[in-house]
Interface confidence: low
């Protein structure tokens, strides 16, 4: 299906590519000696990049700092020093550059202020950093300013005094709407959710916090939860972990109406040393990790129903180190329903698993064609691919990048990996899949940085090396053939690749520095591939591809979550521009239903290797510890519930007698006496 990758051999060299790239390579040398550089894209497809360089000299008592701000509006080809727009002020890098949502063009930089000042200082821009306004704050910010996703003029911030401050006019004026706030988040429709401590402090009151909501930017408030440990938002779900009455355990509660009503999630409770983590969430469902008791480094993944209440066990022994620690859980955005993660086996080896149906079934990644099993494999002919992700990076393995996929580069997944029975500590190679993870091929020998340009029309890579580099590699056929281009005669210490988020651009910026005996100078090289992909792609450049196809003879081939999708994909042999306005062309068609399209409802489970849902024996004749909307009520079910996002029609309908499950609400989480509405007068 795909040949082994090659570099400059057995591959048609693109005509005149060196001349074309040389004419489109732009160098920019930054005239400062800064120790660190941070880069932000402002807006989508605007070409505007802000670069903040910082230089800190630690002195005995204070540290003297200097910042420089640069702006490009041509995707990094040219930069202009605009430090004067921020009055040559030192910018606090821990707050980063707060870039507004969508294409608002808004930017906030938080400045360093002297010790005795009344409040902090920010520089605000609403025209894509063409101009900045200095604003002195009535508080010292603890967190970066957070924009409301719905209205970029609305900002919230926490102060060092734990005050919740809100601005309605893009930071020009601020109002403290609440004190003693531990965590605040924007929800939908400009709603703010936040937890407050009642007695001592956020840390001391953990598990005794209150969850509040304001829908009018602080005019009025409603207490929507008590005895809160923490809360989170995912998709259309609001989650809260709530302390139990009797002991120190806590449980997850979920709301789909911004906290007006709550249901207890059918998930195990956790103790003090354990944690819950929302791995991924969309409008349909949520992946939830529940930590195992003890310091095991693993837990269980559960997938939810459409209400976020009923959970099915999805994957055991899921690697997740500690709270806020490392997990390899990766959403493969280039193909619907695909996720990759790692499990920790009994012998403490780490193995990669992939699901193609949103967590319904997990399997090992197929061994790449023409690859040999490494030393971790017991059987030298049978093994699988194991992917390096966050955990490997945290362990300082020679892995410069996590797996990469882009929604508009359909089917493409690029990752570092090794072939064997488990992840290897040996130097990894780079592998690519062009079908969303079903099949894999070695793309590059040894570790590399990589990025996708022009919706998959070009893949760019740079070797990971501790020596200065001056070569960039690129492929126009999804990683099969590679060309090398010397982008500078003077090699640089490489620090990163930067391309516009969204993989639609044809520009790549190579960042690094040159070092002489006394000075280090930052430099960027921006390479524009527009002349490599000389013409716009036409109809004949695309071919149809059925996603998730594993058995072309079967009428259900390609059916995942009740429907199949046929895509128009660029032929590997076509060297042309998808272009910035490229929209993925897909043709969905509905599949007939089968039992695979349903999960087991509350009180039911699927015995191993069975497709039917059967009643859980331990629940027969018992009152269930289950609380729907915080009220005692009857739950009726036929034992099956359509998988969230499943679009199947007709076919098999698992009809059976509807059972009435009498159950008792054991959660006093929403004790009505605790639900207050307050006004901020």
């Amino acid at each position: 299906r795909r040949g082994a990758p090659a570099e400059d051999q057995d591959c048609g060299r693109l005509p005149d590519f060196i001349a074309k790239l040389t004419n489109n390579t732009h160098q920019h040398v930054f005239d400062d000696l800064s120790g660190s550089v941070s880069l932000s894209w402002v807006g989508d497809s605007t070409g505007v990049i802000l670069v903040l360089t910082t230089f800190q000299v630690p002195l005995v008592i204070v540290s003297f700092g200097q910042s420089k701000l640069y702006r490009s509006e041509d995707y990094g080809k040219n930069f202009k020093d605009i430090t004067n727009l921020i009055n040559n002020t030192f910018i606090r890098t821990e707050f980063g550059m707060a870039i507004g949502p969508e294409n608002s063009g808004k930017v906030i930089l938080t400045a360093e202020v002297s010790g005795g000042s009344r409040g902090g200082r920010v520089f605000r821009s609403s025209d894509f950093a063409k101009n900045f306004v200095q604003t002195d704050l009535p508080f010292h910010p603890l967190t970066q300013m957070m924009y409301s996703p719905q209205n970029s003029d609305y900002l919230l911030a926490l102060s060092t005094e734990n005050g919740l401050w809100v601005s309605k006019n893009f930071g020009e004026k601020w109002e403290e709407i609440h004190k003693a706030v531990c965590l605040a988040k924007w929800g939908p429709n400009n709603i703010i959710f936040f937890t407050t401590h009642v007695n001592g402090s956020c840390k001391a009151d953990l598990g005794a916090l209150e969850l509040w909501r304001t829908s009018d930017l602080g005019k009025t408030f409603k207490t929507i939860g008590v005895k809160i440990y923490s809360f989170g938002l995912g998709g259309r779900f609001l989650f809260a972990s709530v302390m139990a009455d009797k002991d120190t355990t806590r449980r997850i509660h979920v709301s789909t109406d911004q906290g007006d009503t709550w249901s207890m999630a059918q998930l195990p409770s956790v103790g003090q040393e354990q944690f819950y983590s929302i791995l991924a969430a969309n409008e349909d469902m949520v992946f939830m990790h529940v930590d195992e008791p003890g310091d095991t480094g693993f837990g269980t993944i559960f997938t939810s129903d459409d209400r976020g209440i009923v959970y099915s066990k999805s994957l055991d022994r899921h690697l997740y180190t500690t709270t806020g620690g490392e997990t390899d859980f990766t959403n493969v955005t280039s193909l619907r329903g695909v996720y990759i993660t790692s499990t920790l086996s009994e012998d403490n080896s780490i193995q990669s698993m992939i699901t193609f149906d949103q967590g319904g079934r997990w399997e090992h990644l197929r061994k790449p064609e023409n690859s040999k099993c490494d030393a971790t494999a017991k059987n030298k002919n049978e093994c699988s691919l194991h992917i390096h992700a966050s955990y490997s990076i945290s362990q300082k393995l020679n892995v410069p990048m996590a797996p990469l996929s882009e929604p508009n580069a359909v089917g493409i997944v690029i990752a570092h990996g090794s072939v064997g029975d488990a992840i290897s500590v040996m130097v990894p190679d780079v592998y690519i899949s062009d079908d969303g993870g079903y099949s894999w091929a070695k793309m590059l020998e040894g570790p590399h940085y990589y990025t996708i340009l022009d919706s998959g029309g070009i893949i760019v890579a740079i070797e990971h090396s501790n020596r200065p580099i001056n070569v960039i590699k690129f492929s126009t056929d999804e990683g099969q053939c590679w060309q090398s281009y010397v982008f500078t005669q003077e090699p640089i210490y490489f620090t990163g690749l930067a391309s516009e988020p969204g993989a639609r651009s044809m520009n790549i910026s190579i960042w690094g520095f040159t070092e002489s005996f006394i000075t280090r100078q930052w430099v960027s090289y921006t390479v524009d591939f527009k002349d490599i992909l000389e013409r716009n792609c036409e109809e004949d450049d695309y071919t149809t591809w059925l996603a998730h196809s594993t058995d072309p003879g079967d009428y259900k081939d390609g059916c995942i979550l009740g429907y199949k999708e046929q895509f128009l994909r660029l032929r590997k042999s076509s060297v042309c521009q998808n272009g910035r306005d490229y929209v993925v062309a897909k043709q969905p068609s509905v599949c007939p239903c089968s039992l695979e399209d349903f999960l087991c409802d509350f009180g039911y489970f699927r015995p191993e290797n069975a497709s039917e849902c059967v009643e859980q024996p331990e629940l027969k004749g018992h009152e269930l510890e289950f609380c729907l909307y915080g009220k005692e009520e009857h739950l009726t079910t036929n034992g099956y519930r359509k998988i969230p996002g499943d679009k199947c029609q007709g076919g098999m309908n698992p009809a059976r007698e509807v059972k009435d499950l009498k159950k008792k609400c054991t959660s006093n989480f929403l004790n009505p006496t605790k639900q207050n509405s307050k006004s901020n007068s």
């Epitope: 732009h26 807006g43 989508d44 497809s45 605007t46 070409g47 505007v48 509006e73 041509d74 995707y75 080809k77 040219n78 202009k80 294409n103 063009g105 025209d127 894509f128 063409k130 527009k530 272009g579 910035r580 306005d581």
Partner: antibody, heavy 129, light 107 residues
Framework: QVQLVQSGAEVKKPGASVKVSCKAS????????MSWVRQAPGQGLEWMGI????????SYAQKFQGRVTMTRDTSTSTVYMELSSLRSEDTAVYYC??????????????????????WGQGTTVTVSS | EIVMTQSPATLSVSPGERATLSCRAS??????LAWYQQKPGQAPRLLIY???TRATGIPARFSGSGSGTEFTLTISSLQSEDFAVYYC?????????FGGGTKVEIK
């Protein structure tokens, strides 16, 4: 202050060429693109093309391809627009205009456009036999 | 190329009244649209960029709206100095193109 000053009026015969200059001041010349726009008597505005003063790269409207040449001199912060093979219908006022987002004039543009924010006073070119 | 169509060609309005000018693109230009004002014998002056953002120094009575193919310039209360020709211009795809203009005259 930011301003663009253009050269004086010209009278030309059909078939001749004209070269109009536009001197920029009050800002960093190489940081902004420059568009050329013309307006025939009693008519609307017509975009002719754009130049990037930093690298000198250009993009011309199809209608003027082959007849128009835009150049720049960074030492004097001046851009030039030369139009050859003049015809009577080229009689118009020619404007240079600073175009901050001109990068995309040759292809799909950025999703945000700043507009042509500073204009020259215009140069009248009359083509008559 | 993208064709920009402005309507009406002429708009007669009394001072103090509201004026609404329309601009339609032959295909989507996203928000890559600018509005200009031109008075006789003068160069055009930028009023609105990014479809809705007022340029520096432009009074608040001028506002722009729209996205995609339909755009509107509104002058909430016409002053004597507002009587002029108004042009819209797209910058989504090269070549940049202007509308034919709307002349706002005193009623």
């Amino acid at each position: 202050q930011v301003q663009l000053v253009q050269s004086g009026a010209e009278v030309k015969k059909p078939g001749a060429s004209v070269k109009v200059s536009c001197k920029a001041s009050g800002y960093t010349f190489t940081s902004y693109y420059m568009s050329w726009v013309r307006q025939a008597p009693g008519q609307g505005l017509e975009w002719m093309g754009i130049i990037n003063p930093s690298g000198g790269s250009t993009s011309y409207a199809q209608k003027f391809q082959g007849r128009v040449t835009m150049t720049r001199d960074t030492s004097t912060s001046t851009v030039y627009m030369e139009l050859s093979s003049l015809r009577s219908e080229d009689t118009a006022v020619y404007y240079c205009a600073r175009d901050p987002s001109g990068i995309a004039a040759a292809g799909p543009a950025s999703r945000y456009y700043y507009g042509m924010d500073v204009w020259g006073q215009g140069t009248t070119v009359t083509v008559s036999s | 190329e993208i064709v920009m169509t402005q309507s009406p060609a002429t708009l007669s309005v009394s001072p103090g009244e509201r004026a609404t000018l329309s601009c339609r693109a032959s295909q989507s230009v996203s928000s890559n649209l600018a509005w200009y004002q031109q008075k006789p014998g003068q160069a055009p002056r930028l009023l609105i960029y990014g479809a809705s953002t007022r340029a520096t120094g432009i009074p608040a009575r001028f506002s722009g709206s729209g996205s995609g193919t339909e755009f509107t310039l509104t002058i909430s209360s016409l002053q004597s100095e507002d009587f002029a020709v108004y042009y819209c211009q797209q910058a989504r795809l090269g070549p940049w193109t202007f509308g034919g203009g709307t002349k706002v005259e005193i009623k």
